[in-house]
């Protein structure tokens, strides 16, 4: 029951970070820059990993995309392709993990595999969150590092045109949803991670043993498939008991005339 | 890098008009606003009019009813309608943008190199 509570729980937190991964790669509002000095409206300038927009007072909006990769910083680039990752690892881990879940029955599949999976997608999920943080990290140390044009005034040399460059950049909501957003699908990937460990399939109580019936070919094996998986408490097939009853390695060893048509 | 060219100064007769007008070239992402300022000889350059990409435009309180700030998005250009002018608007008239030459660097003031209105009988 804690097993099924845990690896629900680390579905459900994955789900909701890689949720917040998406949203916050998809806002506008990874940095912001306020302008003061304006006599006619109060503007207001944001970006984003796609596009650049401008928000008057007045409440008209303007946004434009960056519709040209070669002039795009490599920073900025990295960042995108690590948010990509993180969202396409996010989605792969969520599909792997519904099925892995313990309450969902599809077909007779073992509970070894269902561990499996479940380790699979933790793994991703803690990925994904990796990523994630890392690419909102790396767009933030971009903003403290003054990576956009730091210069309080540029002289371009043409007819005294000068040109004062406004640097109040502050973090935009989306790094601060892209930082807890990581850190609940890096959350919810331990938890499946850990919910894998008790989904794996304890020891059974079976005996792989075979019953030879005197004068007939008939292998009878207790407990149907499970008592041949290998996980039975006779792992290393010692002679249980005599009286027509064989360890399966003593079947195959010791051929008797019965085993011959 | 964004260029702005102002065009239009000249002689004029006081209570006669002028139209001046400001084109912005060069690599341009975004221009929210553009605005127009002054300095006339020997004082500090003062604002005159501006407008919005959205539409929104001020005006100092001494060309207020005088003056006209108009603006073409398409053609990113801003253009100053000057009617009734006065001795005391003799000065020269600087185009300047708050722009951005690549989106993802913040919007930064563009100055042109200025136009001289001279009004004189």
């Known amino acids: 029951m804690a097993v099924t509570a845990c690896q629900g729980l680390g579905f459900v937190v994955s789900l909701i970070g890689i949720a917040g991964i998406i949203a916050a790669t998809c806002m506008d509002q990874w940095s912001t820059q306020d302008l003061y000095n304006n006599p006619v409206t109060a503007v207001f300038n944001y970006q984003g990993l796609w596009r650049s927009c401008v928000r008057e007072s007045s409440g008209f909006t303007e946004c434009r995309g960056y519709f040209t990769l070669l002039g795009l910083p490599a920073m900025l680039q990295a960042v995108r392709a690590l948010m990509i990752v993180g969202i396409v690892l996010g989605a792969i881990g969520l599909l792997v993990s519904i099925f892995a879940l313990k309450c969902i029955r599809i077909g007779s599949m073992e509970d070894s595999a269902k561990a499996n999976m479940t380790l699979t997608s933790g793994i991703m999920f803690i990925v994904s969150g990796l990523c994630a943080i890392a690419g909102v990290s790396v767009f933030a140390n971009m903003l403290v590092t003054n990576f956009w044009m730091s210069t309080a005034n540029m002289y371009t040399g043409m007819g005294g045109m000068v040109q004062t460059v406004q640097t109040r950049y502050t973090f935009g909501a989306a790094l601060f949803v892209g930082w807890v957003a990581g850190g609940l699908t890096l959350i919810g990937g331990v938890m499946m991670c850990i919910a894998c460990r008790g989904l794996a399939p304890e020891e059974t109580n079976y005996k792989a043993v075979s019953y030879h019936a005197s004068g007939h070919s008939v292998a009878y094996k207790p407990g149907g498939f499970k008592a041949s998986t290998g996980f039975g408490s006779n792992t290393k097939n010692k002679k249980i008991y005599d009286g027509g009853a064989r360890t399966e390695d003593e079947v195959q060893s010791y051929p008797s005339k019965h085993d011959y048509v | 890098q964004v260029q702005l060219v102002e065009s239009g100064g000249g002689l004029v007769q006081p209570g006669g008009s002028l139209r001046l007008s400001c084109a912005a070239s060069?690599?341009?992402?975004?221009?929210?606003?553009m605005t127009w300022y002054r300095q006339a000889l020997g004082k500090e350059r003062e604002f005159v009019a501006g407008i919005s990409k959205g539409g929104t435009s001020n005006y100092a309180d001494s060309v207020k009813g005088r003056f006209t700030v108009s603006r073409d998005n398409a053609k990113n250009t801003v253009y100053l309608q000057m009617n009734s002018l006065k001795s005391e608007d003799t000065a020269v008239y600087y185009c300047n943008a708050q722009a951005s030459s690549f989106g993802w660097m913040p919007l930064s003031d563009y100055w042109g190199q200025g136009t001289l209105v001279t009004v004189s009988s």
């Open positions: 060069g690599s341009i992402f975004s221009i929210p606003v």
